[in-house]
Amino acid sequence: SERCDDWGLDTMRQIQVFEDEPARIKCPLFEHFLKFNYSTAHSAGLTLIWYWTRQDRDLEEPINFRLPENRISKEKDVLWFRPTLLNDTGNYTCMLRNTTYCSKVAFPLEVVQKDSCFNSPMKLPVHKLYIEYGIQRITCPNVDGYFPSSVKPTITWYMGCYKIQNFNNVIPEGMNLSFLIAFISNNGNYTCVVTYPENGRTFHLTRTLTVKVVGSPKNAVPPVIHSPNDHVVYEKEPGEELLIPCTVYFSFLMDSRNEVWWTIDGKKPDDIPIDVTINESISHSRTEDETRTQILSIKKVTSEDLKRSYVCHARSAKGEVAKAATVKQKVPAPRYTVELACGFGAT
């Protein structure tokens, strides 16, 4: 056959679907690889062909579109399973071609099993909710296109294994799950089960996501430098190791980049001709507030180093702060035989 632009295996699209549920999978060519859509391609006389390679096999096979009850079908640029079976797992290829043009891409499809509490190997999306913030909603994801708007599905929401049905702070409202106010106790996995009829059959769509309750922007503050501070003096003798921790608290802010850095005499440590190392550790609170600690270390400090200015800086979307460490050269303790004796007038 003539040359075909092969985009290879698109592993960015690790498609996972539940066993015994409908699945609609769009050909990735039109979403990620080509600059035109299916309608344009179809109008231009291009044909979309589907085939697959079973799990642990090398042989490409055509997809059987003549199964009972049209279990697998194609509609425009969508491959439909009504429903999936476990052995549908494999690599699927969609190819767009005519006599002069050819382009194809493959993608992995994994059909996974779930238990009665919706536990499965499925990778779960994470939805962050602000703590004690007021009304916030999550929407049952990826159910568009499964049924026409004239069909009114029933939707049941679960937290973990349990159906949500009381009027507490989390209230099912059709496709939405409304959090009247979110608390740490609302962290967990939430599942919506959408049930709809089609051609005399009943289908179920199961969608699970993880809710993580995070710090509210109402409570967010600029970075707070806990150390260095005015109460601690770093007093060292030349030759000793100098260790100065810079500990900064950052409020959780969605999509904010938190930064901590040291300057020595106004310059980055890399630009100073001294043997300095900086180690960073990061910890998070339950609401994803962040504490970053950068320890500045000079193994054998010199008297010159003890005269320098050491400043810790921090920045987030809420602002920038800086704090200088108080560093001093330790005055050597007097040696009794000489200094003290002289002091007492000894001869």
């Epitope: 007021g134 939707i155 009381n166 702070n169 209230i171 409202e173 106010i181």
Partner: antibody, heavy 118, light 111 residues
């Protein structure tokens, strides 16, 4: 189309109970909550409580706690509101109304006038 | 005494614009969505606005809603005689228990 049909007007004596019914049609009964709202003559709207027809769970306004009971019969798509220990100030039009909690009450029954008089 | 405060009455001439305010607190309007209802004389209330500013299908775009801080506003442009009615704002509070709250209502008179 969505319809909520309520039972007819009632006249009750103080201390008695009244039970108002609301039959739903035109939608999946268990997919929406049912609110009860009352309106005294010439007054504003007052929320009494809500029932989840799916599981039967309820939440009542503090003012009516202990005096109101909301139930449902899924076989007939009907919800009921019973108010006990009636007093003259309970004279009002009682509405059942379909809706969610956070996105408004989208369909209302025609209302049932309850008159409490000795 | 309603938790949400509305002016008892407003009036305007046909074709004019009118706004109805609804004032609450951080525990109700401040943190939550507001709905608005129209009640024509002798009829049940009808949903006009939900989620602060969304219109159900069939509600003309002459009706609009907005929210700022702990207050909400219903706007009606191109006033018509059939708009003469009572208007109610509604939201909820949750402090360990759910409570749906209505404003006291505003009587709109079309002059």
């Amino acid at each position: 189309q969505v319809q909520l049909v309520q039972s007819g007007a009632e006249v009750k004596k103080p201390g008695a109970s009244v039970k108002v019914s609301c039959k739903a049609s035109g939608y999946t009964f268990t997919s929406y909550y049912m609110h009860w709202v009352r309106q005294a003559p010439g007054q504003g709207l007052e929320w009494m409580g809500i029932i989840n027809p799916s599981g039967g769970s309820t939440s009542y306004a503090q003012k009516f706690q202990g005096r109101v009971t909301m139930t449902r019969d899924t076989s007939t798509s009907t919800v009921y509101m019973e108010l006990s220990s009636l007093r003259s100030e309970d004279t009002a039009v009682y509405y059942c109304a379909r809706g969610f909690v956070t996105s408004g009450i989208d369909y209302w029954g025609q209302g049932t006038l309850v008159t409490v008089s000795s | 005494q309603s938790v949400l405060t509305q002016p008892p009455s407003v009036s305007a001439a046909p074709g004019q614009k009118v706004t109805i305010s609804c004032s609450g607190s951080s525990s109700n309007i401040g943190n939550n969505y507001v709905s608005w209802y129209q009640q024509l004389p002798g009829t049940a209330p009808k949903l006009l606005i939900y989620d602060n500013n969304k219109r159900p299908s069939g509600i003309p775009d002459r009706f609009s809603g907005s929210k700022s801080g702990t207050s909400a506003t219903l706007g009606i442009t191109g006033l018509q005689t059939e708009d003469e009615a009572d208007y109610y704002c509604q939201t909820w509070t949750y402090t360990g228990r759910l409570w749906i709250v209505f404003g006291g209502g505003t009587k709109l008179t079309v002059l």
